[in-house]
């Protein structure tokens, strides 16, 4: 039998290599089965997570799955960081896998590079 | 029934490239992490690195960066494993595995193939 | 990169007595998320590794609950409470906490 525990579906360790102006879209699968929880974004500082308040966020329906969307418009090189989501269900509290956002400024690089690159290269990053 | 079948071995020349195939089935290989881990003949594992086939993001180990591609194709469950510049140490058993990426629910491994560098 | 060092490399157990391999990383493998990303692995003769243990103590669904993992920080055990002959083989653990990934050197369970 399928279990009717809220699940979050971001990968552990896992990443996006974006770039500083682009508009990016950062989803949090939700699984849930009768009512929607309440989930919100946070961004890491050092081991505590701040909730972003005044966010731009929707929510996308698909067959198995919802999507909880934090969205960057544009992306800024100070969105770099890790983020959470975590969802409210009957008054627990379940948090995902951070997820890190490598933020490239796309003035201080003469051409785009690849994401894996980024990923590899800190210098390339904002703190 | 969960599988991951590794293909491409054999015998490859020093210098030459190989590519090698894990396809999956039984599960959805976007949920997961596919790494490639090798291992010489009678010594230990090695890992090689891992990709994110939601996303085709990859992680190396330092000994395997600029030499090994890690890859996948999500529409066919299939991962792929590509080494250039072989040298006759690269000859060794190499697996696949597939772990899970939200919970760690399940890990994976395949058979193993084997490649044999030599003239 | 974090150094996996298991000891003993070499185990030699007499049937239905217990076996304990330990396990020590050269730093901590407690990730941010309060989790430690141990597993132990067996490979017996002849055969590709099998995940055994997740997570430093959680079992696959299949293995039997003579083994067990214990651990934490930079010091994890996994213990056979009572060796069968199908334990033979090689045994693993494995670090995924850390970039890169690393594995201890394995150690040999025979029997006596």
């Known amino acids: 039998k399928e279990s009717c525990d809220v699940q979050l579906y971001i990968k552990r360790q896992s990443y996006h290599s974006i770039f500083a102006g682009d508009p990016f879209k950062l989803e949090c699968p939700v699984k849930y089965c009768a009512h929607r929880p309440q989930v919100t974004w946070c961004k890491l500082n050092g081991t505590t997570c701040v909730k972003l308040e005044g966010r731009h966020t929707s929510w996308k329906q698909e067959k198995n799955l919802s999507f909880f969307i934090l969205h960057f418009e544009p992306v800024l090189p100070s969105d770099n960081g890790s983020y959470r989501c975590s969802a409210n269900f009957l008054s627990a509290i379940i948090e995902s896998h951070s997820t890190t956002l490598y933020v490239t400024d796309v003035k201080s690089a003469s051409e785009r590079p690849s994401k894996d690159e980024m990923a590899s290269r800190p210098w390339l990053l904002y703190s | 029934e969960v599988q991951l079948v590794e293909s491409g071995g054999g015998l490859v020349q020093p210098g030459g490239s190989l590519k090698l195939s894990c396809a999956t089935s039984g599960f959805n290989i976007k949920d997961t992490y596919i790494h490639w881990v090798r291992q010489a003949s009678g010594k230990g594992l090695e890992w090689i690195g891992r990709?994110?086939?939601?996303?085709?993001?990859?992680k190396y180990a330092a000994s395997f960066k600029g030499r090994a591609t890690i890859s996948a194709d999500d529409s066919k469950n299939t991962a792929y494993l590509q080494l250039n510049s072989l040298k006759t140490e690269d000859t060794a058993v190499y697996y696949c595995?597939?772990?899970?990426?939200?919970?760690?629910?399940?890990?994976?491994w395949g058979q193993g193939t084997l490649v044999t560098v030599s003239s | 990169d974090v150094v996996m060092t298991q000891s003993p490399l070499s185990l030699p157990v007499t049937l239905g007595q217990p076996a304990s391999i330990s396990c020590r990383s050269s730093q901590s493998l407690l990730d941010r998320d309060g989790k430690t990303y141990l597993n132990w692995l067996q490979q017996r003769p002849g055969q590709s590794p099998r995940r055994l243990i997740y997570l430093v103590s959680k079992r696959d669904s299949g293995v039997p609950d003579r083994f067990s993992g214990s651990g934490s920080g930079t010091d994890f055990t996994l213990k056979i409470s009572r060796v069968e002959a199908e334990d033979v083989g090689v045994y693993y653990c494995w670090q995924d906490t850390h970039f890169p990934y690393t594995f201890g050197q394995g150690t040999k369970l025979e029997i006596k």
């Open positions: 595995a597939s772990y899970e990426g939200y919970y760690e629910r399940f890990g994976y």
């Open positions: 990709n994110d086939p939601a996303n085709g993001n990859t």
